[in-house]
């Protein structure tokens, strides 16, 4: 009883190419076939006497084949026999092309054959390998071959039988003696313990065949020495098993909540300081000059749109200047040089005058804004959401969608910071990166709108017919200094036309 | 019992079309090569195409390639040939063949349908 | 293209053993198939993979192929065995036949 074994070292066939000539589609997946039988002076087709075995799939068109004894016997391929070795054989080694899976003749390709040799000849039983190389016209196949005997057999023949075993009982071979001689691998008396891979951890490594290291549970790795963490972990590590310690900068069970979102995304722009706030929350400090959340926003003087009537907002190193459209003027071109007479009003709108015909105000339709209706309204484009919020259009109206940590119609409230409401008197708060600010109502100032200021009496523009108009700061009252022809406390009656008393 | 059964031959002039079928049954028709062969009346066999058991793969004779076209149904386990542009030398007897995959022939072969190219 | 050449004709008296050959370059580097067809019948596969026999054939039919030719033959020959025989291999557009060889039984 023996083994003939083949081992096929490389197959060339450069031109991926069948033995008919024809291109594999798609390149030629090459798997073999070997017969294996009786001398014969002329190898001829027949029955394969002394065994067959067939190969998987090896490589595409050219490749080495690489030894695989340990790993289960696929290369050396194995033709075991159960007779005296004759000493003589006949070998066919067929290559061929399987385009799918399915090794079985009937799913080839009708031409599968690649190539197809045959020899024959002596061959001795012995651990010698006999290289060999065969070449057709468009291939070569290089390939050792040998007989050894099976395990338990000896001799020139392998007629000879010993009692040497490889199971649970002991792995050993017999000596020329009888002694054990362990298979490498195994160690003991009886050579029935295993040797494990070289490294195995002790404790949370064992095995159940040489080389070979299987890990306890919780333990992974080549040698079972790396701890298996709790299933589910993100960013973490574990010393011993199912554990999850965060790597920093993250928290939570699993280790998949961001803790430093300043690191891992650098949010702020423009060189700001970034301040981790919470899980996926931060802040940015700005430096001089810049705003926004993020401070993306370099700031202007002109970006709260001063100029009105639609004039064009120039920045300069003191502040802005307004270059007015033809009709206005005024440092903020708030005044007017145009009347109702010349139709000023766009989009509908209705023209009412004022101060006797000096000046105009245009009542616009809905949808339609600005001194003389020339916008169409989107309630969005002034971008009136603070900190970040979303612009919503609802139909006449908006809305803003705040991000988490703010509130107020526009978002211009921190939740934590405004709160409480600070600002006294009626004053809006608003929250800033690093605290809040109070915005007063006419009259009041300071810090938190403690303090009371004198009114400028003269704003609503009470006096008429041009008139110049004067604050009394002790009273919070004005005075109107009438032009020739006008008298009245607001310059309202002409001269000669007394006023009309009710009694 | 494994069969081959041909059908759709006739008379065609020159130019014209027609399409050939072959029904299998008695064997797994989708695990299958199958090809069609001819002969010419009084002449040796020729090979005109093949096509892959899943039909992914066609391959065909330069006699004929660009105007005919194998192409199979494994649902109906039918083969089909489509011949174009007829000329008078493809007058033959068509043979729907199955090819015995790995090198083995053309195992089974049907009864044969006649194509007749003539004005 | 390849060509597969095979002679004409070959004539064989009964009981007598014919052979008939199929000629090319490398062609033992290939597997040969051969058919056998009688007048107004379709082929028949007798010999594959150069010298397998399908199940149904007679042990009377054998093949060989080495070198540049494949050899169909038939021992103890019979009047049965009059047919047109034609060899196949593949070439790289397809399959290739040869030109067929008229068997005669005397």
């Known amino acids: 009883s023996g083994v003939f074994q083949l081992q096929l070292q490389e197959f060339i066939n450069e031109r991926g190419v069948l033995a008919s000539g024809r291109p594999c589609e798609p390149g030629c997946r090459t798997f073999f076939r070997v017969c294996l039988k009786h001398f014969q002076a002329v190898v001829s087709p027949g029955p394969c006497t002394f065994g067959t075995v067939s190969t998987p799939v090896l490589g595409t068109n050219s490749f080495a084949v690489r030894d695989d004894s340990s790993g289960g016997g696929r290369n050396p391929l194995q033709l075991p026999f159960n007779f005296t070795w004759p000493g003589t054989f006949s070998l066919i080694i067929e290559a061929w092309h399987a385009p799918g899976d399915d090794l079985r003749p009937e799913a080839l390709p009708p031409d599968a054959l690649i190539s197809k040799i045959a020899i024959q000849g002596s061959l001795a039983v012995g651990q010698n390998w006999l290289l060999d190389e065969q070449t057709s016209t468009l291939t070569r196949l290089r390939y050792s071959y040998r007989v050894i005997c099976s395990d338990n057999y000896y001799g020139d023949n392998c007629s000879r039988l010993c009692k040497k075993r490889n199971d649970h009982f002991g792995h050993y071979v017999c000596q020329p003696d009888g002694n054990l001689s362990c298979l490498p691998g195994w160690t003991g008396e009886y050579c029935q313990q295993p040797i494990c891979l070289s490294g195995c951890h002790e404790q949370n490594g064992y095995c159940s065949k040489p080389a070979e290291c299987l890990c306890r549970p919780g333990w992974q790795g080549r040698l079972c020495n790396e701890c298996i963490p709790h299933n589910g972990c993100r960013h973490g590590t574990c010393s011993t098993p199912w554990q999850c310690t965060c790597d920093e900068g993250w928290g939570g069970l699993f280790c998949d909540q961001d803790l430093n979102y300043c690191t891992h995304h650098s949010p702020c722009k423009n060189g700001a300081t970034c301040s981790n706030s919470g899980q996926r929350s931060y802040t940015c400090t700005c430096r001089p000059g810049y705003t926004g959340v993020d401070c993306e926003l370099e700031l202007s003087e002109c970006d709260s749109n001063p100029c009105r009537n639609g004039g064009s907002c120039k920045d300069q190193e003191d502040g802005y200047h307004c270059l007015c459209p033809p009709g206005y003027y005024g440092l903020h071109c708030e005044h007017s040089t145009l009347s109702c007479a010349d139709s000023p009003c766009f989009n509908g709108g209705s023209c009412r005058e004022r101060n006797q015909g000096a000046n105009y105000a245009c009542e616009c339709p809905p949808n339609f804004t600005g001194s003389n209706c020339e916008k169409k309204v989107d309630r969005c484009t002034s971008n009136p959401c603070a900190n970040g919020g979303q612009c919503l259009n609802r139909g006449p109206s908006r809305m803003c969608r705040c991000r988490p940590g703010f509130t107020g119609t526009y978002c211009e409230l921190h939740v934590s910071d405004c709160a409480r409401n600070p600002c006294a008197h009626g004053g809006t708060c608003h929250d800033l990166e690093n605290g809040l600010m109070c915005t007063c109502p006419a009259g009041f100032s300071g810090r938190r709108c403690e303090v009371r200021t004198s009114i400028d009496a003269c704003a609503s523009s009470p006096c008429f017919n041009r008139a110049t108009c004067y604050t009394d700061l002790s009273t919070d009252t004005f005075v109107c200094n009438c032009p020739y022809g006008f008298v009245g406390s607001r310059c309202e009656f002409p001269v000669g036309l007394p006023p009309s008393f009710p009694w | 019992e494994v069969q081959l059964v041909e059908s759709g031959g006739g008379v065609v002039q020159p130019g014209g079309s027609l399409r050939l079928s072959c029904a299998a049954s008695g064997f797994t028709f989708g695990s299958h090569w199958m090809s069609w062969v001819r002969q010419a009346p009084g002449k040796g066999l020729e090979w005109v195409a093949d096509i892959s058991n899943d039909g992914r793969y066609a391959y065909s004779a330069d006699s004929v390639k660009g105007r005919f076209t194998i192409s199979r149904d494994n649902s109906k386990n039918t083969l089909y040939l489509q011949l174009n542009s007829l000329r008078a030398e493809d007058t033959a007897v068509y043979y729907c063949?199955?090819?015995?995959?790995?090198?083995?022939?053309?195992?089974?072969w049907g009864q044969g349908t006649m194509v007749t190219v003539s004005s | 293209s390849y060509e597969l050449t095979q002679p004409p004709s070959v004539s064989v008296s009964p009981g007598q053993t014919a052979s008939i050959t199929c000629s090319a370059d490398n062609l033992g580097n290939q597997y040969v198939s051969w058919y056998q067809q009688k007048p107004g019948q379709s082929p028949v596969l007798v010999i594959y993979?150069?010298?397998m026999r399908p199940s149904g054939i007679p042990e009377r039919f054998s093949g060989s192929n080495s070198g540049n030719t494949a050899t169909l033959t038939i021992s103890g020959t019979q009047a049965m065995d009059e047919a047109d025989y034609y060899c196949q291999a593949w070439d790289s557009s397809g399959a290739v036949f040869g030109g067929g060889t008229k068997l005669t039984v005397l």
């Open positions: 993979q150069d010298g």
């Open positions: 063949a199955k090819a015995g995959g790995g090198n083995v022939g053309f195992d089974i």
